[in-house]
């Protein structure tokens, strides 16, 4: 499956929207930095099969959608930007779903990618626990926004690599 160019553009648009969502001066949030333990190895195209990497991307976008769809998230961010962000994520989920099912049979996906999906879920669990611990403070959301931007950037670069391998 060749990830469409539109998916890459969508990813870039999502990153731009994330960048625009900042509401407070992030310089005041330095002490709130946290090690979320991004599961980089899950997205390593050399170690894993293409279908597994795509499946991990899918899970990351799904979890990002879930994270930013909460009541607490809606209170933290600009509604218009958030709606645009949802649309980009939804489009990417559709692209990736088509790609994963094309790579392997649907019934094989769950088993084959269980570990990588679990690693992504645990990563987002750590993010959610951090936000809860910080009582969803503006700085906690800023730190999470920066973290999601970094993980998106990382996966975007890997998607470019996957397209080149084709």
């Amino acid at each position: 499956c060749d990830l469409p160019q539109t998916h890459s553009l969508g990813n870039r648009r999502a990153l731009i929207l994330l960048a625009q969502m900042g509401r407070i001066s992030h310089f005041s949030c330095l002490k709130d930095r946290y090690d979320f333990g991004f599961p980089q190895e899950v997205f390593d195209g050399n170690q894993f099969q293409k279908a597994q990497a795509i499946s991990a991307f899918h899970e990351m976008i799904q979890q990002t959608f879930n994270l930013f769809s909460t009541k607490d998230s809606s209170a933290a961010w600009d509604e218009t930007l958030l709606d645009k962000f949802y649309i980009e994520l939804f489009q990417q989920l559709n692209d990736l779903e088509a790609c994963v099912t094309q790579e392997v049979g649907v019934e094989e996906i769950a088993l084959m990618n269980e570990d990588s999906i679990l690693a992504v879920r645990k990563y987002f669990q750590r993010i959610t626990l951090y936000l809860m611990g910080k009582k969803y403070s503006p700085c906690a959301w800023e730190v999470v926004r920066a973290e999601i931007m970094r993980s998106f950037s990382f996966s975007t670069n890997l998607q470019k690599g996957l397209r080149r391998k084709d």
Epitope: A19, H26, L30, K31, R150
Partner: antibody, heavy 121, light 107 residues
């Protein structure tokens, strides 16, 4: 390969203006902040301020607030440090360094080679 | 502002010695502390970040410890290339501040 390349040494007279630069390459320039550090002859390191090139938001040390201006042009991956009126006490080596922002990653992991600014009448 | 105080300001040691430099913050900075090495005419080089994480490419003889207000940089066995000035820097909040430096000289 990540690199921060600073502009060359400058010799200026008191009262003159100056703008020095720091060009980043080998990484996503807008994903990191750029900090500026002063080192006067034979002295220690002093943090001056920082900029987020993605939105040009800045923060300054109170000691340098109003004395210098930090800016960036993300289209050419370059950060700047400028003075509108130099003083003899501005004579120092100035370093730029990249900072991971709010991400959990090493602070100031890459530094420019430094720009020596000499202010003398 | 958070003040950073390093001690000693200078020390003399021999190759193979174990060297310890301490850094104290004027208020708690959790583990937001970095250590840098600077040689004459060169830019500083990051050694340790977040109090105890070894920066990529830095020899394992360098280690950092501490949290809150008291921190330590240890060089387990001093090598000829380690003679330099070392700075601690708090990364907890702006304005970022450095210690005054510790110069490690040859005995």
């Amino acid at each position: 390969e990540v690199q921060l390349v600073q502009s060359g040494a400058e010799v200026k007279k008191p009262g003159e203006s100056l703008k020095i630069s720091c060009k980043g390459s080998g990484y996503s320039f807008t994903s990191y902040w750029i900090g500026w550090v002063r080192q006067m002859p034979g002295k220690g390191l002093e943090w001056m301020g920082i900029i987020d090139p993605s939105d040009s938001d800045t923060a300054y040390s109170p000691s340098f607030q109003g004395q210098v201006t930090i800016s960036a042009d993300k289209s050419i991956s370059t950060a700047y440090l400028q003075w509108s009126s130099l003083k003899a006490s501005d004579t120092a080596m100035y370093y730029c360094a990249r900072h991971p922002g709010l991400n959990w990653a090493p602070d100031f992991d890459y530094w420019g080679q430094g720009t020596l600014v000499t202010v003398s009448s | 502002d958070i003040q950073m105080t390093q001690s000693p300001s200078s020390l003399s040691a021999s190759v193979g010695d174990r060297v310890t430099i301490t850094c104290r913050a004027s208020q708690s900075i959790d583990e937001f502390l970095n250590w840098y090495q600077q040689k004459p005419g060169k830019a500083p080089k990051l050694l340790i970040y977040f109090a105890s994480s070894l920066q990529s490419g830095v020899p394992s003889r360098f280690s950092g410890s501490g949290s809150g207000t008291d921190f330590t940089l240890t060089i387990s066995s001093l090598q000829p290339e380690d003679f330099a000035t070392y700075y601690c820097q708090q990364a907890h909040s702006f304005p970022l501040t450095f210690g005054q430096g510790t110069k490690v000289e040859i005995k």
